[in-house]
């Protein structure tokens, strides 16, 4: 590895191309470590407030973690000549709260993007598509890692965080080639209805450690390539027939359902029957009831229909307050 002090050469064109001279092709920015052999640049934990302007053209793997970037403007990585080799970009834990449309434009080889652990109060609908066209040029992204990007409550906007993220995922149908999507630890209460339909190539979907209560309005039908679906540590109470049938119909899928507060009443009967016969659910023998109290910690696979009853709903005249 080499580390070098920087000169004034190079800069991206942020909307207006007000910048500098083209970079020396193998120069290492100040505060970064570079390995041309590994095609890797690491500018980690350096309190950077902007993306370095003089990145070497050979960079394939760029780590900008643990900085203070705050905002990624349009063309944040655009260079003349472009960073044509950049394939993996890790921006996790860099205090980003704003990612604008076109932030990742002019990165023709970008296959993996990690924005995890940034409190994204604003994620432009066009952050990944780069344009506001109804159908935009396909993004080269194959892996998109967005774990723990939910901002603190006082920084959340009026519109739903789920909706903001969903809009960025579906804009321009740009992410049709996405294979991996991680959305863990985002306090999601629901999954917007049409998101998955726009991501037909998904093989791995991580929605663990959210607050999903139901999958009733989510369709997995299009995800014929899906291999792993992580739904651990949510607030799921039961999976209904439509969801069960869709999951069963996916040829390669493995579903992870641990640590959800399953409600073992009469509505659980279909799910229990399905669990007993399916090979789709990994660790299904670990799934236990959380409610009602009398069923707590009972193993779902050990239940039978007689165990799964619902208290009768009393007519209003017989109800007591």
């Amino acid at each position: 590895t080499s580390s070098a002090s920087s000169s004034s050469s190079s800069a991206p064109f942020l909307a207006s191309a007000a910048s500098a001279q083209p970079p020396l092709p193998d120069q290492c920015p100040a505060l970064c470590e570079c390995s041309e052999a590994a095609r890797t640049v690491k500018c980690v934990n350096r309190n950077l407030t902007e993306v370095p302007t003089d990145l070497p053209l050979y960079v394939r793997n760029l780590f900008l973690t643990g900085n203070q970037l705050a905002v990624l403007p349009a063309g944040a990585f655009a260079r003349r000549p472009p960073l044509a080799e950049l394939a993996a970009l890790n921006l996790s834990g860099s205090r980003l709260d704003e990612v604008r449309g076109g932030a990742f434009e002019h990165l023709p080889s970008l296959r993996q993007l990690d924005l995890s652990h940034n409190p994204l109060a604003y994620l432009s609908p066009f952050a990944f598509s780069g344009s506001n066209a109804s159908i935009s040029a396909p993004s080269p992204l194959v892996e998109l890692i967005l774990n723990h990007i939910v901002p603190p409550d006082d920084k959340r906007q009026n519109r739903s965080f789920e909706g903001m993220v969903a809009a960025a995922l579906v804009a321009g149908r740009a992410l049709q080639g996405l294979h991996l999507l991680e959305l863990a630890s985002n306090h999601f209460l629901y999954l917007p209805r049409d998101v998955l339909a726009q991501l037909p190539s998904l093989r791995y979907l991580d929605l663990s450690n959210n607050s999903l209560v139901s999958l009733t309005y989510v369709s997995f039908r299009n995800l014929t390539h899906l291999e792993s679906l992580h739904l651990e540590d949510n607030a799921l109470k039961v999976l209904h027939n439509g969801t069960l049938a869709e999951l069963q119909g996916l040829p390669h899928v493995r579903v992870f359902l641990d640590n959800n507060p399953w409600v073992c009443d009469c509505h659980m009967a279909d799910m229990v029957t399905w669990l007993k016969q399916t090979g789709v659910v990994q660790g299904k023998d670990r799934l236990t009831c959380a409610f009602p109290e009398k069923m707590r910690n009972r193993v779902l696979l050990e239940l039978n229909s007689a165990d799964l009853d619902c208290d009768p709903i009393l007519p209003p005249s017989l109800q007591t307050s």
Partner: antibody, heavy 120, light 111 residues
Framework: DVQLVESGGGLVQPGGSRKLSCAAS????????MHWVRQAPEKGLEWVAY????????YYADTVKGRFTISRDNPKNTLFLQMTSLRSEDTAMYYC?????????????WGAGTTVTVSS | DIVLTQSPASLAVSLGQRATISCRAS??????????LHWYQQKPGQPPKLLIK???NLESGVPARFSGTGSGTDFTLNIHPVEEEDTATYYC?????????FGAGTKLELK
Amino acid sequence: DVQLVESGGGLVQPGGSRKLSCAASGFTFSNFGMHWVRQAPEKGLEWVAYISSGSTSFYYADTVKGRFTISRDNPKNTLFLQMTSLRSEDTAMYYCSRTNSLLRGFFDAWGAGTTVTVSS
Amino acid sequence: DIVLTQSPASLAVSLGQRATISCRASQSVSSSSYTYLHWYQQKPGQPPKLLIKSASNLESGVPARFSGTGSGTDFTLNIHPVEEEDTATYYCQHSWEIPLTFGAGTKLELK
């Protein structure tokens, strides 16, 4: 007290070169991004160039791109602006200014300025 | 480039009255997380001085008679009550993108 003191201005012929300096004191220079801003006689303010705290990022106005180079020496608490191929329209008062970051920042401290006159 | 249009170019206000200066951007300079518009005061023969950052946040040490409002493309600097020492030129500036640009300035004089 935050202090920025520019120097190096003077009379330069068109096509000539000049190097401006800005000496900083009263704050941790290496923690702040720095700008050069200029003001032509009886005119408004024009942003010229920016350098990040650790010299990882550099930005220039189109009017000076390729002719001016911003740099800094953190151990010596000094900011520089190397100006080449000077033109009459570069005649101005040149100010250095401090910022906490480029886009999320603002010019929160200014020097008194140094005058550059480009004339034959 | 983003153009900031200040109006009026100059104004004369009586002591104790209100001065209102407008700054209009050619495109939005606000996001849901930050407003990228700042105000400066420049007195003759002196460098500019930061008054208000992010549209409405008073810089430390600036008198409370200065206030800023606005978001998106329309911003206002108010001075009330105007004092003699407020005679100066006032500039707005955006930091939305490169290049950073300033308005042309508004010269405030006392009647």
